[in-house]
């Protein structure tokens, strides 16, 4: 007997899609061998229609795909736009069609439902609204109008024009009689339930001259849309529930193994802890549609998701819903990168952000996830030279090391910097990753003075002390601007005396500014790197003032008590924070992240190439 397993029978209707899962023993050989779906011929052969090696028959062009999930030992064949011609016997299998590693599947596609002997068929999705129209003749215009539901052999009254409403329909049904010109009444049922499905009879009048009309109501559960995304990547659920629920609370929930649907996020402010820092529910449109973005996809995120609308913000019978089945592919194209980066107060972090290497020219962005309301992610920096005002001098986005990775450096860390940050581009929206910055106990490794004042026309020397742990690293000074940090010449002045228990491998590297001009004012960073991978940095603000007395200035660590110009960072931090714009293009329906940025955040410039390093700031 074959070890392959799958559905023996699949029944569907014209126009539908099917998703056929075939199971195989997940041995190393099986995981990597060819997977196929073929149609059995009358004389015993089996003609390949689609395979995992990229072949797609002309019969399936544009309407089928085959996806392998080696970690689960399954592959899935999706076939859309079914017709009755697709009915037949098929095999799903591994290896070569004629060998025995296969499973027989019978696919039967029947005609869709139509009108049956004067019965009007209403096919409506669960939770939506149906209007059943009932014509009548003039002689019954003044007579009682009613709607019955056939339960077994007996018709049960649902609603009538005298005000009766069956308790099963309370609060969600009404009977409308059109103006005198139209000989029609209609019954509107909202929040449709599966139990509402069945045969209905509407009637005008109660005697032998009454007008009757049959209706067949079919209530469909939404077919889950199949969504395949990569581990560590991102998914967007677009939820369009219709304008009738525009003002009702919205939710996204994930169905557990039972019938419960656990809320992932809703518009009432609820959010599941497992999605903290990696989910955004974007603002609703006027038509009631919204979308939810989840980044940093994990294996356990796979499953069935429902979005819906209900005043409770969770799934209830009668909620209009949309469904998705999310598969998370563990053979991901998105490389592993640390999900947590640690730094110390006053220190720095260097975050590596992956992007699709085919999109090296895309604009890179870094934003700070905020959990308030439904979540948002105001931009902090981009690769085109824009930096949010309160991050000037301490944040840089560098194109290095390139080839699928960019680097973000943040220094002068405070406890307020702890939180979740997203790396993204205006290209492939699936490549959105999340990193959490944690501020831990400890001292910064690099020691620099606090704010420094230089005198016009004189020479300024600024020291940076590197402990011995960085002996093998390249040490540098650079001047920060919106486009990165331009390297400056520096002098190695031998071992540093700033560290206890640190040997000759510690280093004092100084920055020298000769004949200081006004243009020298600004932020300077000293840091370490290995090739194109950046490590820790420390920042010093150099102010320039008029000459008071002659001479050159050396700055020592004694002046380093005050934190670097925290006034600049603090003033207006909360004020500007609240002006951050919810960027509509942070959602996958549009490729680009908007250029509409917080105008309060200062002028645009242009962020350049810089560099990157292992994740972890001053805590190594």
């Amino acid at each position: 007997k074959s070890p392959i397993f799958g559905p023996e029978e699949v029944n569907s209707v014209e126009g539908n899609s099917v998703s056929i899962t075939c199971y195989y023993p997940p041995t190393s050989v099986n995981r990597h061998t060819r997977k196929y779906w073929c149609r059995q011929g009358a004389r015993g052969g089996c003609i390949t229609l689609i395979s995992s090696e990229g072949y797609v028959s002309s019969k399936y062009a544009g309407r089928a795909n085959l996806t392998n999930f080696p970690e689960n030992g399954t592959f899935v064949v999706n076939i859309a736009q079914l017709s009755q011609d697709d009915s037949g016997r098929y095999k799903c299998g591994l290896g070569i069609n004629s060998r025995g590693l296969s499973f027989d599947v019978s696919l039967e596609v029947s005609q869709g439902p139509g009108l049956l002997n004067d019965t009007k068929v209403y096919t409506v999705d669960l939770g939506r609204t149906v209007t059943i129209n009932c014509p009548f003749k003039t002689e019954n215009a003044q007579k009682r109008k009613s709607l019955y539901k056939q339960i077994g052999l007996y018709p049960v009254l649902v609603i009538d024009s005298s005000g009766y409403v069956n308790p099963n329909y309370t609060g969600r049904i009404r009977l409308d009689i059109q103006g005198t010109g139209q000989l029609l009444f209609s019954v509107v049922i909202n929040q449709l339930r599966l139990s509402d499905a069945g045969q209905y009879l509407c009637q005008a009048g109660d005697d032998s001259n009454s007008n009757k009309k049959n209706a067949d109501l079919q209530v469909l559960k939404p077919e889950p849309e199949l969504v395949y995304e990569d581990l560590r990547g991102s998914v967007t659920f677009h939820c369009a529930l219709g304008p009738e629920v525009a003002n009702v609370a919205k939710f996204l929930c994930r169905q557990s193994s039972g019938e419960n649907c656990d809320v992932v996020v809703n518009t009432l402010g609820k959010r599941a802890p497992a999605f903290e820092g990696r989910i955004l529910l974007n603002p609703q449109d006027k038509d009631g549609s919204f979308s939810v973005v989840i980044t940093g996809l994990r294996k356990e995120d796979a499953g069935r998701y429902l979005c819906g609308a209900h005043s409770d913000g969770q799934l209830q019978e009668g909620s209009p819903i949309q469904a998705w089945q999310l598969f998370v592919n563990e053979e991901s194209t998105i490389p592993r990168s640390p999900t947590v980066v640690k730094g110390v107060a006053g220190g720095s972090v260097a975050v590596l952000c992956p992007y699709n290497r085919k999109e090296s020219k895309s604009i890179k962005y870094w934003c700070l996830w905020e959990g308030a309301q439904n979540g948002r992610c105001p931009l902090l920096v981009d690769s085109e030279g824009w930096v949010k005002a309160q991050y000037e001098g301490r944040l840089s986005l560098l194109e290095e090391p390139g080839n699928g990775t960019f680097t973000v450096i943040l220094n002068q860390l405070t406890s307020r910097d702890a939180g979740f940050y997203w790396c993204l581009t205006n290209g492939d929206t699936l490549w959105r990753t999340t990193v959490e910055i944690k501020i831990i106990e400890g001292e910064p490794n690099l020691k620099v003075p606090g704010n420094v004042t230089a005198v016009l026309g004189e020479t300024l020397k600024v020291p940076c002390h590197f402990p011995c742990k960085f002996s093998s690293y390249e040490k540098y000074w650079c001047k920060w601007n919106n486009t990165g940090c331009q390297a400056l010449p520096s002098q190695d002045e031998g071992p540093s005396k700033a560290f206890v228990n640190c040997d000759e491998n510690s280093r004092l590297v100084s920055l020298t500014l000769n004949l200081v001009t006004r243009a020298d004012e600004g932020w300077y960073w000293c840091g370490v790197k290995q090739g194109h991978f950046y490590g820790e940095t420390a920042a010093v603000y150099v102010a320039v003032e008029e000459r008071k007395a002659a001479g050159s200035r050396d700055v020592s660590l004694a002046k380093a008590d005050a934190a670097p110009d925290e006034k600049v960072l603090d003033s207006g931090f909360r004020e500007i924070e609240n002006k951050a714009i919810q960027d509509p293009r942070l959602f996958a329906e549009e490729k680009a992240v908007a250029d509409t940025r917080d105008q309060a955040d200062g002028s645009r410039a242009s962020v350049d190439s810089g560099s990157s390093e292992e994740q972890g700031g001053s805590s190594r």
């Epitope: 699949v10 169905q255 557990s256």
Partner: nanobody, 126 residues
Framework: EVQLVESGGGLVQAGDSLRLSCAAS????????MGWFRQAPGKDREFVAT??????????YYADPVKGRFTISRDNAKNTVYLQMNSLKPEDTAVYYC?????????????????WGQGTLVTVSS
Amino acid sequence: EVQLVESGGGLVQAGDSLRLSCAASGRTFTTYVMGWFRQAPGKDREFVATITWSGSTNYKYYADPVKGRFTISRDNAKNTVYLQMNSLKPEDTAVYYCTSSTVVTDPRKLNEYAYWGQGTLVTVSS
């Protein structure tokens, strides 16, 4: 919660037929999977057949020993699943359990099903 009630079990002769029914009630509007497992005396519970659905599409899965003899079907309006058992054999003797869930990644695995009925006994004498 979902309640499942099986019926239709009994004593039959080898070669006879039997039809089991399972009626679901309660929070069935998120049920997309219903199936049958069985447990013979002194043995582990084993997969028999499962039907999963999505809109108007049904998928039917069967265990090898019952292929070609058993047929699973459902009546959506009645929230009921049926197991038509033909050409019964003495080795089909077991307690048959109805089960349901929202979604299963592998229909053969009993731990993936959230709800179980009390079971109905089928005895096939030779």
